[in-house]
Amino acid sequence: QPCPYPMAPPNGHVSPVQAKYILKDSFSIFCETGYELLQGHLPLKSFTAVCQKDGSWDRPMPACSIVDCGPPDDLPSGRVEYITGPGVTTYKAVIQYSCEETFYTMKVNDGKYVCEADGFWTSSKGEKSLPVCEPVCGLSARTTGGRIYGGQKAKPGDFPWQVLILGGTTAAGALLYDNWVLTAAHAVYEQKHDASALDIRMGTLKRLSPHYTQAWSEAVFIHEGYTHDAGFDNDIALIKLNNKVVINSNITPICLPRKEAESFMRTDDIGTASGWGLTQRGFLARNLMYVDIPIVDHQKCTAAYEKPPYPRGSVTANMLCAGLESGGKDSCRGDSGGALVFLDSETERWFVGGIVSWGSMNCGEAGQYGVYTKVINYIPWIENIISDF
């Protein structure tokens, strides 16, 4: 007994085509490009039916339905716009991703995606993953570089990368991207095995204010070349936050130095240090303070720290010094881990050139200088940690 002649579903065809189909004969259904085999909501890669001895097919005809890529995934810190038409998500539909202006910029591709025949939203470069809205770094309400101890009060948006680190001693750090904090190894050394003990606060000027954005640490990475209680070489650490922070005018990451950044960090170039460390009155600052200080010739700095009580070789090639020969302007205890920043006049973005590390016991002392970890020496280390974790 022959089986009923198989009528191809719309947008599909039957193969092989025969005059009649008898016991054990079979046919397959193939869909046109942009259409897929579906049995209800369940997708099929292939479909073959076999003629049974009672003259019926062993399974019902599927549909060739237009491929539907479904609603596109939400883009963190961005949005999606339907280009083809409101809510259209079927084959050849186009959508456009964009990032929240000012504070984020799109990485990976141009954000235009098309619903392809395989059912995935695909960029013009062939990527099926979402684009990335990366925080814009180095934005500040302060537009000039140049002219804490001997410092001035910061205003909202001046140092939006500034991070207050509690959980042990008071220290500082600088936001990188939206889920990393750059700081000094000595500031977080005690918490390296207990990252969750770090209380990380940002988006505030007042050290004791109850109004701040709270972040918590997921992991602490201390440079493997740092030896606690044996000098300050490689005094650098990264804290990975357990969540991304929302970027705004009061919370913005600092840029890492470009290869060309050394041209903005020559002797006498002005950097800016900020923090809540000790002021001239000998107390931790209530309000975030900042000080503009010039870079000091490396040999001059080395010489300043060659005499007792400082051991020979205290100042290494991984450090840079800043301050006035006459003293009075410096970072101090409590500022540790904070960023010494410089304005890149080509990109008009601020970048971190140094990390507050160490100095003389008497902050702002004449003939002594603040010593900072030279960040440009650690770019490969920073990039490796961030890409691996």
Partner: antibody, heavy 115, light 107 residues
Framework: EVQLQESGPGLVKPSQTLSLTCTVS?????????WNWIRQPPGNKLEWMGY???????SYNPSLKSRITISRDTSKNQFSLKLSSVTAADTAVYYC????????WGQGTTVTVSS | DIQMTQSPSSLSASVGDRVTITCKAS??????VAWYQQKPGKVPKALIY???YRYSGVPSRFSGSGSGTDFTLTISSLQPEDVATYYC?????????FGQGTKLEIK
Amino acid sequence: EVQLQESGPGLVKPSQTLSLTCTVSGYSITSDYAWNWIRQPPGNKLEWMGYISYSGRTSYNPSLKSRITISRDTSKNQFSLKLSSVTAADTAVYYCAVLYALDYWGQGTTVTVSS
Amino acid sequence: DIQMTQSPSSLSASVGDRVTITCKASQNVDTNVAWYQQKPGKVPKALIYSASYRYSGVPSRFSGSGSGTDFTLTISSLQPEDVATYYCQQYNSNPLTFGQGTKLEIK
């Protein structure tokens, strides 16, 4: 013969993420069909959670969409379920299954959400 | 979501009886309906797919019919091993949904 086997912790704390893996033998998950997760709370009816298709596309129950992720590891012929922010209401027997023309289910694994 | 409403919620019948379980969909599901049998403490076992197609190995006493919104599972001659809970399921649209179950017992 096609076989599916669920694996994962039997106890999950509230607010944590439930993670289960389904290992498939006797059939490649990239060959065809939709590979599903279905659960059954104690004394209750079955609830479809979502699937990952042969091509890697996913479809989720809208009631779980903000919490569920189904992924696969084709090299191990496995597909996995992650359900975040669990509560006591997520206590159930969890099954992996391939439905429709090929219909096979795992034996099920009981997951209890409790502190 | 498409609701699948089974009736009765439980029933008791004698060995050899003809048993009918019905399932009503809240909207058209074409013939994209499956029937499952679940014995206590066991995994659901598929009996029928596409409303009327029996899985291989399923006894011929089990049959399914219907399309659109009304579906029926029939056991032509009830056997002692058929004691179980039976579920209908629609796979026509997202989310796939199951009926609340029909518990079948032997008198």
